[in-house]
Interface confidence: medium
């Protein structure tokens, strides 16, 4: 068993209240908590197959490769934002997608349709695709629509999703979970494939890396808050872009399980040198998600 230590905000707390010295112990295939709670609720983050963002500089995803990726369509406008499936009833997305803007009531759940298990935007009626209306949109109460701080929202589905090879939830990281600088992470979406371009039909994927927070703050002065993280390459080339907002950053963790590291939020252009994409950190919102969804 792993050493039990004094609990801090940086340690994983087991259900029995004891805390572990081991980092990121959840759903890694090893029971580290004496009550086994670190391996409970782990029906997430696995794909049914194994094969060796606006995403700029990405490639076409395989069908079913990112079964938690969701496409949000606004009434009469087509795909607007991405989201991730975290349970049969709930999605995680970006709050800025749901601000009323230019005369359209984006904050109204009845104006949205979620497509789960979607691969090709032109094939929304394909087998395996599940269409769901939204019942509720919960934007973070601290969301700031000037700075994009706390850019996270929860979307409740009107009818639960049915898990399948194409539709599966992503794992949510514990509040203590660390995604270190340099870690490779995947960004996915149907957003623009170049800045000022057009959206992709086929789901795109791009591998990017977590950037040191101090570097991030220096690259985008006065704009980065503790709720944000930079992910990408200083050389540019691969990035999320307009239309990828709200989608997940997928991080392959121990035991091959995939955890959501962040939410696509904003950027200064797309895939530019020294302008990495900015994402909402997921671990900081674990308690808020649980309070609002029970997940």
């Amino acid at each position: 068993k792993v050493n039990v230590v004094t609990c801090t905000k940086h340690t994983y707390r087991c259900l029995n209240g004891l805390c572990l010295s081991k980092g990121n112990p959840e759903c890694d295939g090893k029971e580290d908590c004496s009550d086994g709670s670190d391996e409970k609720d782990c029906d997430c983050g696995l794909r049914s197959f194994t094969r060796q963002a606006r995403v700029v500089g990405g490639t076409d995803a395989d069908e079913g490769e990112w079964p938690w990726q969701v496409s949000l369509h606004a009434l009469g406008q087509g795909h607007i934002c991405g989201a991730s499936l975290i349970s049969p009833n709930w999605l995680v997305s970006a709050a800025h997608c749901y601000i009323d803007d230019r005369g359209f009531r984006y904050s109204d759940p009845t104006q949205w349709t979620a497509f789960l298990g979607l691969h090709d935007q032109s094939q929304r009626s394909a087998p395996g695709v599940q269409e769901r209306r939204l019942k509720r949109i919960i934007s973070h109460p601290f969301f700031n629509d000037f700075t994009f701080d706390y850019d996270i929202a929860l979307l409740e589905l009107e009818k639960p999703a049915e898990y399948s090879s194409m539709v599966r939830p992503i794992c949510l990281p514990d509040a203590s979970h660390v995604f270190p600088a340099g870690k490779a992470i995947w960004v996915t979406g149907w957003g623009h494939t170049q800045y000022g371009g057009t959206g992709a039909l086929i789901l795109q994927k791009g591998e990017i890396r977590v950037i040191n927070q101090t570097t991030c703050e220096n690259l985008l002065p006065q704009q980065i808050t503790p709720r944000m993280m930079c992910v990408g390459f200083l050389s540019g080339g691969v990035d999320s872009c307009q239309g990828d907002s709200g989608g997940p950053l997928s991080s392959v963790e121990a035991d091959g399980r995939i955890f959501q590291a962040g939410v696509v939020s904003w950027g200064d252009g797309c895939a530019q040198r020294n302008k990495p994409g900015v994402y909402t950190r997921l671990p900081l919102f674990r308690d808020w998600i649980k309070e609002n969804t029970g997940v």
């Epitope: 800025h96 803007d101 230019r102 629509d145 000037f146 002065p221 704009q223 950027g267 200064d268």
Partner: antibody, heavy 122, light 108 residues
Framework: EVQLLESGGGLVQPGGSLRLSCAAS????????MSWVRQAPGKGLEWVSA????????HYADSVKGRFTISRDNSKNTLYLQMNSLRAEDTAVYYC???????????????WGQGTLVTVSS | EIVLTQSPGTLSLSPGERATLSCRAS???????LAWYQQKPGQAPRLLIY???SRATVIPDRFSGSGSGTDFTLTISRLEPEDFAVYYC?????????FGQGTKVEIK
Amino acid sequence: EVQLLESGGGLVQPGGSLRLSCAASGFTFSSYAMSWVRQAPGKGLEWVSAISSSGVNTHYADSVKGRFTISRDNSKNTLYLQMNSLRAEDTAVYYCATIASIALRGYYFDYWGQGTLVTVSS
Amino acid sequence: EIVLTQSPGTLSLSPGERATLSCRASQTFGSSYLAWYQQKPGQAPRLLIYGASSRATVIPDRFSGSGSGTDFTLTISRLEPEDFAVYYCQQYGSSPWTFGQGTKVEIK
């Protein structure tokens, strides 16, 4: 057609107060972030204050912080600027302007009113 | 705050000529966060360019923006009589949002 009509300007003594209004029409006012920008006679433009579409979040230039208050009434399609403790250097034409789509991370001003002149003098 | 310096202060040109206006920032603020406005006497400013290079709606294609880092340029490829005005650049990448002091384009 987007129309913004400012009113409430005039002559006021230093230390006095004034409330500017901006009546909006031709668009869904409640969906736009809004701003006030001023221009002193014969000078350049200076951003003063901004307010998000919901009215929840506000921003101010340091030169007016603590003296000016921006607000909006979405039911009346009106933007306001309450100006207190006015100084001679606040003399300017005050423009109200819509702020471009925040979803595109834009804070530039895409539609402007014709402005209202505020003169602070004894 | 970020100071934007525009040059030249005044540009004297004839209709049909090419105008090149410069805007230099005191520090980098995000290369996409620059706008250009046109203002004629007694009128409100009008948005020309946003995102450093994107033309606003109904702005003719003789207006173009370029640049990154701290140096930005507005180019009017062939001056029309209605283009003689004052032009301002504005950065919106760092609060407070600031304007340059303006460049006046006058008829030679």
